[in-house]
């Protein structure tokens, strides 16, 4: 990896080894100010592989609310507006980092956790395996 | 929000107010063990709105490497394998949390940051604005 020259103004830390505990400021800096506010707002409905968004809430996690996409159909919507099984709707998944309260119910102590979330759906050509 | 009963075994913290600094264990717990290994592995190529993945590296960020999707075409791939501009390939975007080293170059001090990443692409019906 890339070695980072240490800033002499860094806070002290006792343990330099992994697994390590670090200080994190939860005052979130949002880098998304210049993004198009419409973004993917209505793509879930206009897509040929439309999806619904389900609210997943967990007070022991930060962020506590995550939205999960579920594809509406197994097939994709064709030009006639019908579900066509010659194509497949599939979820696009991404691993994201969240903070898990550890020990449980502690407001100021967390552990990083990787979770897999479905962000939306896309329409793919199926892999066809014919019987010999 | 939901109030969480405080665990008496929690570490002490001086500042109980937001913005607050918390302790985070960077030994990542991976909750994705039972997921289908096939996942989105080749969807980027098989999709009617295919995309390329671009590596975004920033040593001041944790995770330092994030993969960004860029749609290959403005239109979508039709049944003949051609790009059809009656439909649009659009990126599915998601806000994710990352840790930003703060002050810069400090190995043990971070600030939460929200960034917008493109995870993949989906094919949507365009919104047609007719001239009056």
């Amino acid at each position: 990896g890339i070695t980072i020259p240490r800033n002499p103004g860094c806070p002290n830390s006792e343990d330099k080894n992994f697994p390590r505990t670090v200080m994190v400021n939860l005052n979130i800096h949002n880098r998304n100010t210049n993004t198009n506010p419409k973004r993917s707002s209505d793509y879930y409905n206009r897509s040929t592989s439309p999806w619904n968004l389900h609210r997943n809430e967990d007070p022991e996690r930060y962020p506590s609310v995550i939205w999960e996409a579920k594809c509406r159909h197994l097939g994709c919507i064709n030009a006639d507006g019908n579900v066509d099984y010659h194509m497949n709707s599939v979820p696009i998944q991404q691993e994201i980092l969240v903070l898990r309260r550890e020990p449980p119910h502690c407001p100021n102590s967390f552990r990083l956790e990787k979770i897999l979330v479905s962000v939306g759906c896309t329409c793919v050509t199926p892999i066809v395996h014919h019987v010999a | 929000g939901i109030t969480i009963p405080r665990n008496p075994g929690c570490p002490n913290s001086e500042d109980k107010n937001f913005p607050r600094t918390v302790m985070v264990n960077l030994n990542i717990h991976n909750r994705n063990t039972n997921t289908n290994p096939k996942r989105s592995s080749d969807y980027y190529n098989r999709s009617t709105s295919p995309w390329n993945l671009h590596r975004n590296e920033d040593p001041e960020r944790y995770p330092s490497v994030i993969w960004e999707a860029k749609c290959r075409h403005l239109g979508c791939i039709n049944a003949d394998g051609n790009v059809d501009y009656h439909m649009n390939s659009v990126p599915i975007q998601q806000e994710i949390l990352v840790l930003r080293r703060e002050p810069p170059h400090c190995p043990n001090s971070f600030r939460l940051e929200k960034i917008l990443v493109s995870v993949g692409c989906t094919c949507v019906t365009p919104i047609v604005h007719h001239v009056a």
């Epitope: 439309p50 579920k70 509406r72 197994l74 099984y85 599939v90 066809v128 395996h129 | 996942r39 098989r46």
Partner: antibody
Framework: QVQVQESGPGLVKPSETLSLTCTVS?????????WNWIRQPPGKGLEWMGY???????SYNPSLKSRVTISRDTSKNQFSLKLSSVTAADTAVYYC?????????????WGQGTLVTVSS | IIVMTQSPLSLPVTLGQPASISCRSS???????????LHWYQQRPGQSPRRLIY???NRFSGVPDRFSGSGSGTDFTLKISRVEAEDVGVYYC????????FGQGTRLEIK
């Protein structure tokens, strides 16, 4: 308890249009299910004809696509089947059925079926 | 269109004995999302079909545990561990990975 009930004429003349309605009780047709039409010719197996989903999207059997239309009336909690240009081969028991649509995609409730005979 | 082929077409079984029905599809039933949408239904004489098994091996609620499903890809099996009199009827496999289709049915009767 969910119930689905087919209704419509039991006799249709060749070349005419067969029309059936399914009335759903105990479940809104706009909740997360697909509403199917499946038929069974006398003494034969089952044939899927098509469905309309909770969101109003339809899907049809490719072999029947040009002749079949499925629609719904959410105010009456009903969905309907129209099959045009019928022949004697369309004589069958017609079932309406609810399909669990939340990553199961299997029919979980069937109507009792209605026999439609195509004859002049 | 996917062709579902069941065997045997007729299955005489002694009460209390096991029974097994095979279903083969002309194409793999694994969807691009990794799931397999293969289901089983029972149709008793003079009745509508009734749900049994969904997605290869999951029993619908209320279905006795003597019914079990297995298989993958293109080859699937429905097993009844001990046949009872009420199990008489026609059993259909069905797939919804592609445009939905049904097998031609297997008639189970008591010897």
């Amino acid at each position: 308890q969910v119930q689905v009930q087919e209704s419509g004429p039991g006799l249709v003349k060749p070349s005419e249009t067969l029309s059936l309605t399914c009335t759903v009780s105990g479940n809104s047709i706009t909740s997360y299910y697909a509403w199917n039409w499946i038929r069974q010719p006398p003494g034969k197996g089952l044939e899927w004809m098509g469905y309309i989903t909770y969101s109003g999207t339809t899907s049809y059997n490719p072999s029947l696509k040009s002749r079949v239309t499925i629609s719904r009336d959410t105010s009456k909690n009903q969905f309907s089947l129209k099959l045009s240009s019928v022949t004697a081969a369309d004589t069958a028991v017609y079932y309406c059925a609810r399909e669990e649509y939340d990553d199961i995609y299997a029919v979980d409730y069937w109507g009792q079926g209605t026999l439609v005979t195509v004859s002049s | 269109i996917i062709v579902m082929t069941q065997s045997p077409l007729s299955l005489p079984v002694t009460l209390g004995q096991p029974a097994s029905i095979s279903c083969r599809s002309s194409q793999s039933l694994v969807h691009s999302n990794g799931n397999t949408y293969l289901h089983w239904y029972q149709q008793r004489p003079g009745q509508s079909p009734r749900r049994l098994i969904y997605k290869v091996y999951n029993r619908f609620s209320g279905v006795p545990d003597r019914f079990s499903g297995s298989g993958s890809g293109t080859d699937f099996t429905l097993k009844i561990s001990r046949v009872e009199a009420e199990d008489v009827g026609v059993y259909y496999c069905s797939q919804s990975t592609h445009f939905p289709t049904f097998g031609q049915g297997t008639r189970l009767e008591i010897k």
